[in-house]
């Protein structure tokens, strides 16, 4: 679709005469007749195919028209058209004498008629005018002519439509040649599709507007390159959406079981070795002059009642020192210079020489002990406490200070590790001696009953086209990540233009 | 052939929400070629588009109903849904889901059957 | 808002060409789709992109687009084509039908 223009400039006839040599009267009131069609080699009466155009009277004999003349013509005059150009056309432009009023063909004597021009040719669309001008032996017509597009046509011919657009079927201009030219943030056949932030992941995400980044199911982070770990994940990361992978020291469906106590809490303290011996269980190994579950209790060296016959013991900061009684000497007061003649033996003991009465050795009545029968037994040194118990000494009593898993006077019971439920998802709990053991229902194993071995909900294959299936281990359901180019749940439906006319 | 089909409550009381449902079958309705609307047509008068959807979840509604109306996709059903809450007797009608073709320049090549929501207590 | 016009009715006799106008602010800056309803039924698309025709769409119905009017032509117009007929074009980003023109073949 188009326009043939022709620009009428200047029109002579200084005789003021019609074709047939006849002068007007009183002079040539001249209007125009024009006729476009096709390409004819000899240009011929006949129907004027492209279309016909006439003008009102423009001057008498002589005159110039001007651009957009006055008396209701249009100047250039318009020829449209509604096909594609072709390139080729013969013009006939008529010039008459209007007698009267009226400027119909049938109004006017056939002898009205002042000159006729025909010409034939090329014709390319575009801007530029190009100038001609026709002589005969009584006029002369200067004029111009060029073929446009209408508006929203364009090309060679004018036969490509586009209309500029920018709502959501399009966002786009109009180049020379009538293809697209979308707008920045735009991409696609028509510019509809828009174009993500730049490093948005192109299969985990999408964007509805430019510069967008939208994360597909299982994807977060302002690029969608982050997975998203199992829901409920505490201390454990994911390379592909709901894992749970644990970091160090965690076990467990959701990584929240410590099985490194140690380093999370560092339970020992004054410098002992701590020992993982289970999930929140551990053991602190003490450094020396340290006792305590925690080794958290500082030991006297004096506690172990070094000094014998009677010597008194004094701790030092570098270990202790005994102050032996009269008759005793050495590191421990081990040494006597005494014999049974002193009566070394307290408490009842019996005196007995040894060496030809060099020496001696006193023999103690029940609850009494030491080289000279100075102590009172010490309870704790038949080592009551069974299971690793602490004995402390109490007075006239002693206590076992048990460790964990075990109880009673003497840390002879052992608690039942089943006390605490430890087995998850409805498990049942076995006590044995050296700890406890898990029966899980279906669907799970592990010490615990923690690992979910439920059925794989991806074992069937559910995702298409490549698709990458995972199991979302708290619904037992899956979930599909879609290669480029695919959508919907299972990754079935490709994304792309249609064909165009699916009837 | 594609095919849309509408479906959804008949009867609503005033005030409350009219929700209507269009399955797709015969294609995808996740491709990005298409937007996929809902347009109604009073008893006796003409039609009125409401708004439109994509694959993605891009909305587009009438001004004149923006405040009114919610449509979204279910790329898994291959279903789009319209929910237009306070409804009144003006909003008695027959409604339609479409196809709005990028390629036919938004163009509607297909329609469901349309379905009668009459608005009444 | 944006608004399209019909003339409420068009009559034609049968072989005859009806002309349908829709107009608009600068309708031909927009692409023109025109759809038939017949009583009962859903509507068909007959014209998009201002002039061209859906396959199974006869040659007889035609349209144009340019200026602030936009026209669908039946040529030798028959009596199943008796139906509304509905102008629609795209405001932005808002889908605006025209009021409908009742053809009917005498």
């Known amino acids: 679709s188009g326009v043939f223009q022709l620009q009428l400039q200047e029109f002579i006839n200084e005789r003021g005469v019609l074709a047939s040599g006849r002068p007007c009267e009183p002079g040539c009131r001249t209007f125009f007749r024009v006729c476009l069609k096709h390409f004819q080699a000899v240009v011929s009466p006949g129907p004027c195919t492209f279309g016909t155009v006439s003008t009102p009277v423009l001057g008498t004999n002589s005159f110039a028209v001007r651009d957009d003349s006055s008396g209701g013509g249009r100047n250039p005059l318009q020829l449209p058209f509604n096909f594609t150009w072709p390139g080729t056309f013969s013009l006939i432009i008529e010039a008459w004498h209007a007698p009267g009023d009226d400027l119909r063909p049938e109004a006017l004597p056939p002898d009205a008629l002042i000159s006729k021009i025909a010409i034939q040719g090329s014709l390319a669309v575009g801007q530029n005018w190009l100038l001609d001008e026709q002589t005969s032996t009584l006029t002369r017509l200067r004029y111009s002519y060029r073929v446009i597009c209408s508006d929203n046509y364009y090309g060679d011919n004018c036969s490509r439509l586009c209309k500029k657009r920018n709502d959501h079927f399009g966002h786009y201009v109009c180049q020379p040649d009538g293809n697209l030219s979308c707008l920045p943030g735009w991409t696609g056949e028509y510019c509809q599709q828009p174009i993500c932030l730049s490093g948005c992941h192109e299969q985990n995400g999408y964007c509805s507007k430019p510069a967008e980044c939208l994360c597909r199911p299982g994807w977060q982070g302002r690029l969608c390159n982050e997975c998203i770990p199992h829901n409920g994940c505490r201390h454990g990361t994911c390379s592909t959406p709901w894992q749970c992978t644990c970091d160090e020291g965690w076990g467990g469906l959701f990584c929240d079981q410590d099985l490194n106590y140690c380093t999370h809490h560092s339970p020992c303290k004054n410098g002992a070795t701590c020992s993982n011996s289970g999930q929140r269980s551990y053991t602190c190994t003490c450094r020396p002059g340290y006792t305590g579950v925690d080794c958290e209790l500082e030991l006297s060296e004096c506690d172990s009642n070094p000094c014998r016959n009677g010597g008194s013991c004094k701790d030092q900061e570098d270990g202790y020192h005994c102050l032996c009684p009269p008759g005793y000497y050495g590191l421990h007061c081990e040494h006597s210079t005494l014999s049974c003649a002193d009566s070394p033996c307290f408490n009842g003991g019996s005196c007995r020489e040894r060496n030809q009465g060099a020496n001696y050795a006193c023999e103690c009545p029940p609850n009494f002990t030491g080289s000279n029968c100075e102590k009172k037994v010490d309870r704790c040194t038949s080592n009551p406490c069974a299971n690793g118990g602490q004995c402390l000494n109490r007075g006239p009593s002693r206590m076992c200070r048990c460790r964990p898993g075990f109880t009673g006077t003497y840390c002879e019971l052992h608690v039942s590790d089943c006390a605490r439920n430890p087995c998850a998802h409805g498990g049942t709990c076995h006590d044995l001696e050296n700890g406890l053991m898990c029966t899980c229902p279906a669907g799970f194993s592990g010490r615990r009953c923690e690992v979910r071995t439920s059925i794989d909900a991806c074992a069937s294959s559910p995702c298409f086209n490549r698709a990458t299936c995972y199991t979302d281990l708290s619904t037992d359901t899956f979930v599909c990540n879609c290669p480029y180019g695919f959508v919907g749940s299972r990754c079935e439906f490709p994304v792309g233009l249609p064909p165009s006319f699916p009837w | 052939e594609v095919q849309l089909q509408e479906s959804g409550p008949g009867l609503v009381k005033p005030s409350e929400t009219l929700s209507l449902t269009c399955t797709v079958s015969?294609?995808?309705?996740?491709?990005?070629?298409?937007?996929w609307g809902w347009i109604r047509q009073p008893p006796g008068k003409g039609l009125e588009w409401i708004g439109d959807i994509n694959y993605a979840g891009s909305t587009y509604y009438n001004p004149s109903l923006k405040s009114r109306v919610t449509i979204s996709v279910d790329t898994s059903k291959n279903q789009f849904s319209l929910k237009l809450s306070s409804v009144t007797a003006a909003d008695t009608a027959v409604y339609y889901c479409?196809?709005?073709?990028?390629?036919?320049?938004?163009?509607?090549?297909?329609w469901g059957q349309g379905t009668l929501v009459t608005v009444s207590s | 808002s944006y608004e399209l016009t019909q003339p409420p009715s068009v009559s034609v006799s049968p072989g005859q060409t009806a002309s349908i106008t829709c107009s608009g602010q600068r309708l031909g800056d927009k692409y023109a789709s025109w759809y038939q309803q017949k009583p009962g039924q859903s509507p068909v698309l007959v014209i998009y992109?201002?002039?061209k025709r859906p396959s199974g769409i006869p040659e007889r119905f035609s349209g144009s687009n340019s200026g602030d009017t936009a026209t669908l032509t039946i040529s030798g117009t028959q009596p199943m084509d008796e139906a509304d007929y509905y102008c629609?074009?795209?405001?932005?980003?808002?889908?605006?039908f025209g009021y409908g023109t009742k053809v009917t073949v005498l």
């Open positions: 992109e201002d002039s």
């Open positions: 015969g294609g995808s309705i996740s491709s990005s070629g298409y937007y």
């Open positions: 479409a196809r709005e073709d990028v390629i036919l320049r938004g163009g509607s090549d297909y």
């Open positions: 629609q074009a795209w405001d932005r980003d808002t889908g605006v």
